[in-house]
Interface confidence: low
Amino acid sequence: FYDIETLKVIDEEWQRTQCSPRETCVEVASELGKSTNTFFKPPCVNVFRCGGCCNEESLICMNTSTSYISKQLFEISVPLTSVPELVPVKVANHTGCKCLPTVPRHPYS
Amino acid sequence: FYDIETLKVIDEEWQRTQCSPRETCVEVASELGKSTNTFFKPPCVNVFRCGGCCNEESLICMNTSTSYISKQLFEISVPLTSVPELVPVKVANHTGCKCLPTVPRHPYS
């Protein structure tokens, strides 16, 4: 049999695994789709993105609201022709998440 | 121009984005490769997995040491023939990570 304490522990873990905004490491260049001769240093930033589990396989954890936060990064052009420049880079930050039905793909898409 | 305080903020963020064990939501069934008629409730657990950024594109964040931690979960077989049973499930927990060269793929693999 199982006691209430065990159930509480399981329930707490389940709450923590559920779909919610989570701090995530995001690669800036791929996020912004920058040209290959432009690099950002650091190449990654921490932002919140939706992640975690949904109760059903037919649901997916999706963002329902997004803010954009500005991160100061060095933008470096190769070949390096000047001192690396500090630029503000806007990155999407998920502020709300929900388990939503996966979009059915058209068979010919 | 940029001052040292700005650099410190950037440096702290960079440290936080680097390859390290991070709390991650893992789907138990796919992790254990269980048959499709066996379900776990909760379906997901929190463990540490290697994640984050490496300095070079040729490197990937990989686990260098792993422990296995036991999680108490309900194992449910379909069709349901008995009361869901609490079972201990061992899940890999990354305890050390390193940026390692990506394994070169054989052209015919």
């Epitope: 240093k41 022709t81 | 650099l7 950037i10 440096d11």
Partner: antibody, heavy 117, light 112 residues
Framework: QVTLKESGPGILQPSQTLSLTCSFS??????????VGWIRQPSGKGLEWLAN???????YYNPVLRSRLTISKDTSNNQVFLKISIVDTADTATYYC?????????WGQGTLVTVSA | DVVMTQTPLSLPVSLGDQASISCRSS???????????LHWYLQKPGQSPKLLIY???NRFSGVPDRFSGSGSGTDFTLKISRVEAEDLGVYFC?????????FGGGTKLEIE
């Protein structure tokens, strides 16, 4: 508070190698984006950028002098070094160490180097 | 290399006068990212250069508002609206758009 201080031999003879040391405080060369460089100024003349080294050990040299310059760092001791090989009298100048930001904000007081036979 | 040409070489002024120093570059100082990395420094006798103006028009912290920078492309100017005794010294323009980073030959501001 950022400070940089240069030290060198003072006087040396033509064809010798000039070794300069920059000791700094108030920042670390392990900090992301940080750089330290060298600039020189012959007496009564203009300024010439020589070289700089970045936190990740990338090095950049003035192309005109590249073959004679070597820059290196000791991050744990907060020091940067510059070597200029085969000096001649044209290398007589005050040598400044700078924290490399865009533009240069923090400079050392400079060290005078005289190349004389 | 980008050649930075400063004029005049020497600028005699009376205290309270306006002073104007010109700096011309051999090629455009507009970086690919849109910024123009043209800076002005003042060097007093026996001292290292001190930053006055960065990126053409921006006064560095602590620099009095009697100093102003202007210009674009290849032509730049530093103006001092009312010269004070502490402003005397050698003024250098500098570019950090192109490697190697280069400096002007200097303009000596002195009392006439």
């Amino acid at each position: 508070q950022v400070t940089l201080k240069e030290s060198g031999p003072g006087i040396l003879q033509p064809s010798q190698t000039l070794s300069l040391t920059c000791s700094f405080s108030g920042f670390s060369l392990s900090t992301y984006g940080m750089g330290v460089g060298w600039i020189r100024q012959p007496s009564g003349k203009g300024l010439e950028w020589l070289a700089n080294i970045w936190w990740n050990d990338d090095k950049y040299y003035n192309p005109v002098l590249r073959s004679r310059l070597t820059i290196s760092k000791d991050t744990s001791n907060n020091q940067v070094f510059l070597k200029i090989s085969i000096v001649d009298t044209a290398d007589t100048a005050t040598y400044y160490c700078v924290q490399v930001t865009n533009p240069f904000v923090f400079w050392g007081q400079g060290t005078l180097v005289t190349v004389s036979a | 290399d980008v050649v930075m040409t400063q004029t005049p070489l020497s600028l005699p002024v009376s205290l309270g006068d306006q002073a104007s120093i010109s700096c011309r570059s051999s090629q455009s100082l507009v970086h690919n990212n849109g910024n123009t990395y043209l800076h002005w420094y003042l060097q007093k006798p026996g001292q290292s250069p001190k930053l006055l103006i960065y990126k053409v028009t921006n006064r560095f912290s602590g620099v009095p508002d009697r100093f102003s920078g202007s210009g674009s492309g290849t032509d730049f100017t530093l103006k001092i609206s009312r010269v004070e005794a502490e402003d005397l010294g050698v003024y250098f323009c500098s570019q950090s758009t192109h490697v190697p980073w280069t400096f002007g030959g200097g303009t000596k501001l002195e009392i006439e």
